[in-house]
């Protein structure tokens, strides 16, 4: 059975085909090759005598087409116009003609596509937004991309116009994207550059920053006011219902409870015409004029040098107040092994050591008034009694020798030396 | 319209807690703060504090700090009014009341019904 | 604390009256003064706000003035539905608010 192979069978535009013929009759005088599904003079595109190898152009032969001596006709340079049947005759000694016909499809080789949309900034939980894949072309997929992945499946997200186009029902902050479409066909695939949309949005119920309510007279008030919106609000402020200015950070100096009120900060985005507020309480606690004296407590206030740890914590009833700690004249801390805590209630030394000892003191002060806790004496001794294993070296044997005359001292030195441990001992 | 509607009264013994509602219809309710305020057998009116229904940060006067907790379930649009540890001095009507903590000159322009706690042994 | 003193306590008057009750703060405040009515056993509402604002749907009778100090509800001509408590308030000191003790308008 002869039969006719189309290879290939999808062909890009411009490119090239080959009409492939299988099981060819042995016995013939020629062939031809017709364009449509049946043999007709005035579509003929070439024939061939195989006795003199010599091809003939039919009418409807464009100068692209080559017969080849097995039947097999090349097409160069394809157009959409030569999609299509492709039939061949094969007239064979005997007479007796045999036909068959193949087909092949041209396709454009695609453009990169583009997106066109319908509104450049849609508002948030307002519009919806319309994504075009331009250009339109005849037997093409449209497929479409968000943050590079296929589309979910949502209820907000509708395509039509054969895929051609997405619609967005109700757009939000989370839209951005980027989008993209792409076009594919049979022979050819290419994507769009990614469009990012620009969703306006907000503002949303702002923030002010800090959260406290509670401050000391004498602090600086320093609220800062925070709305997530695009594009960014217009910011301002009011004092129990007075304007105050348009800023995002509403600043004053020293309060006092004459500053108690409420603080709203009102927020307005002209591009979604919204607007959003948030009331803040503030209370100022007046300051006491006079800071009470405060006490210094000790963990212990005579310490063993490069063994013990010591707290030292600084008592007082006022509120509101900050601590510092002293050293002979300085402040500290002074080392790495001094550590405050507590909002600096507590001061720590782990461990101590001799240059530790001496006066410590602290002050508490309020932006208005300070007063100073009395002395406290820290003592760090060094164990100056020997080892166990030290005890028993003849310190004699040192000392004596020919004209010597150190051993009545020493002798009364050691009476002391024992003496001082038996005390040691006993305390123990 | 704007209404505020408050639960029914309550009588409790001393150093029980009782906890008071303010339905709020007919406005945004987070767009205005609620407040509260006393007014004891025979006596003028006392406001104890508000609530700021965006945020739910409560602020009180000083007389009420302690004892007396506001709060809210804004998907109800209901404010309440938690006292503990009641005493017979905290026998009074009870009334919630809208303010516009924004625009704050417009004082209280909505008041709840009122609600009666009684203590008593 | 401020203090808000009202004058007089209690007046009596009749139906077509004009009726002036006073407020008097211990320390200026501002504008921040409001009015309200309360009837035996209701709910206050509210009648004027900052000092002279009359609220929505309050009849034209009611008027309010004053600053600083010293405030005036003013009713020109009484109704019956206007016998009632009347006090003031003033909410400049946040938060710290306080009230009058009220002026009892009964019928003469």
């Known amino acids: 059975q002869l039969t006719t192979e189309s290879m290939p069978f999808n062909v890009a535009e411009g490119k090239e085909v080959l009409l492939l013929v299988h099981n060819l009759p042995q016995q013939l005088f020629g062939y031809s090759w017709y364009k449509g599904e049946r043999v007709d003079g005035n579509r003929q595109i070439v024939g061939y005598a195989i006795g003199t190898q010599q091809a003939t152009p039919g009418p409807a032969n464009s100068g692209r087409e080559t017969i080849y001596p097995n039947a097999s006709l090349l097409i160069q340079n394809v157009t959409q116009n030569d999609t299509g049947f492709y039939t061949l005759q094969v007239i064979k000694s005997d007479l007796v003609n045999e036909e068959a016909t193949g087909q092949f499809h041209v396709y454009p080789e695609l453009p990169k596509p583009s997106i066109s949309s319908n509104n450049s900034n849609p508002v948030e939980d307002k519009d919806a937004m319309a994504f075009t894949c331009e250009p339109e072309t005849q037997d093409t997929t449209y497929l479409w991309w968000i943050n590079n992945q296929s589309l979910p499946v949502s209820p907000r997200l509708q395509l039509s116009n054969g895929n051609r186009t997405l619609t967005l029902l109700s757009v939000t902050r989370n839209d951005t994207g980027p989008y993209e479409c792409e076009i594919q066909n049979p022979v050819s695939a290419n994507r769009s550059d990614p469009v990012t949309l620009n969703v306006t949005y907000g503002p949303d119920t702002p923030t002010i920053s800090p959260p406290d309510s509670s401050y000391l007279s004498g602090a600086n008030l320093n609220l800062s006011c925070h709305s997530a919106s695009n594009p960014s609000p217009q910011y301002s402020w009011r004092i129990n219902g007075i304007p105050q200015q348009h800023t995002q950070v509403l600043f004053i100096a020293k309060i006092t409870p004459n500053n108690n009120g409420t603080y709203a900060c009102f927020v307005s985005n002209l591009a979604t015409g919204r607007n959003n507020s948030i009331v803040k309480s503030i209370t100022v606690s007046a300051l006491s004029p006079v800071v009470a004296k405060p006490q210094i407590k000790a963990s212990k206030t005579t310490v063993t040098g490069d063994k013990d740890s010591v707290n030292l914590t600084c008592s007082t009833n006022d509120t509101g107040i900050s601590i510092r700690w002293f050293f002979k004249n300085q402040s500290l801390p002074s080392s790495e092994r001094m550590k405050l805590s507590q909002g600096n209630i507590t001061l720590s030394i782990n461990p101590v050591k001799r240059e530790d000892a001496g006066t410590y003191w602290c002050e508490v002060f309020n932006p208005i008034s300070k007063n100073q806790s009395d002395p406290i004496m820290l003592n760090v001794n060094y164990n100056a009694l020997p080892q166990e294993n030290l005890i028993n070296v003849d310190l004699e044997v040192l000392f004596q020798g020919p004209g010597s005359g150190l051993n009545d001292i020493f002798e009364a030195q050691k009476i002391e030396w024992h003496e001082a441990r038996a005390h040691h001992h006993h305390h123990h | 319209q704007v209404q505020l509607v408050q639960s029914g009264s309550e009588l409790k013994k001393p150093g029980a807690s009782v906890k008071v509602s303010c339905k709020a219809s007919g406005y945004t309710f987070t767009e205005f703060g609620m407040s509260w305020v006393r007014q004891a057998p025979g006596q003028g009116l006392e406001w104890m504090g508000w609530?700021?229904?965006?945020?739910?940060?409560?602020t009180y006067v000083e007389e009420f700090k302690g004892r007396f907790v506001f709060s809210l379930d804004t998907s109800v649009s209901t404010a309440y009014l938690q006292i503990s540890s009641l005493k017979a001095e905290d026998t009074a009507v009870y009334y919630c009341a809208r303010w516009d903590a924004f625009e704050y000159v417009k004082a209280l322009d909505y008041w709840g019904q009122g609600t009666t706690v009684t203590v008593s042994s | 604390d401020i203090q808000m003193t009202q004058s007089p306590s209690s007046l009596s008057a009749s139906v077509g009256d004009r009726v002036t009750i006073t407020c008097k703060a211990s320390a200026a405040v501002g504008t921040y003064v409001a009015w309200y009515q309360q009837k035996p056993g209701k709910a206050p509402k509210l009648l004027i706000y900052?000092?002279?604002y009359r609220k929505r749907g309050v009849p034209s009778r009611f008027s309010g003035s004053g600053s600083g100090t010293d405030f005036t509800l003013t009713i020109s001509s009484l109704q019956p539905e206007d016998f009632a408590t009347y006090y003031c308030h003033q909410y400049y000191t946040y938060p710290l608010f306080t009230f009058g003790q009220g002026t009892k308008l009964e019928i003469k």
């Open positions: 609530i700021n229904t965006k945020t739910g940060e409560a």
């Open positions: 900052s000092a002279s």
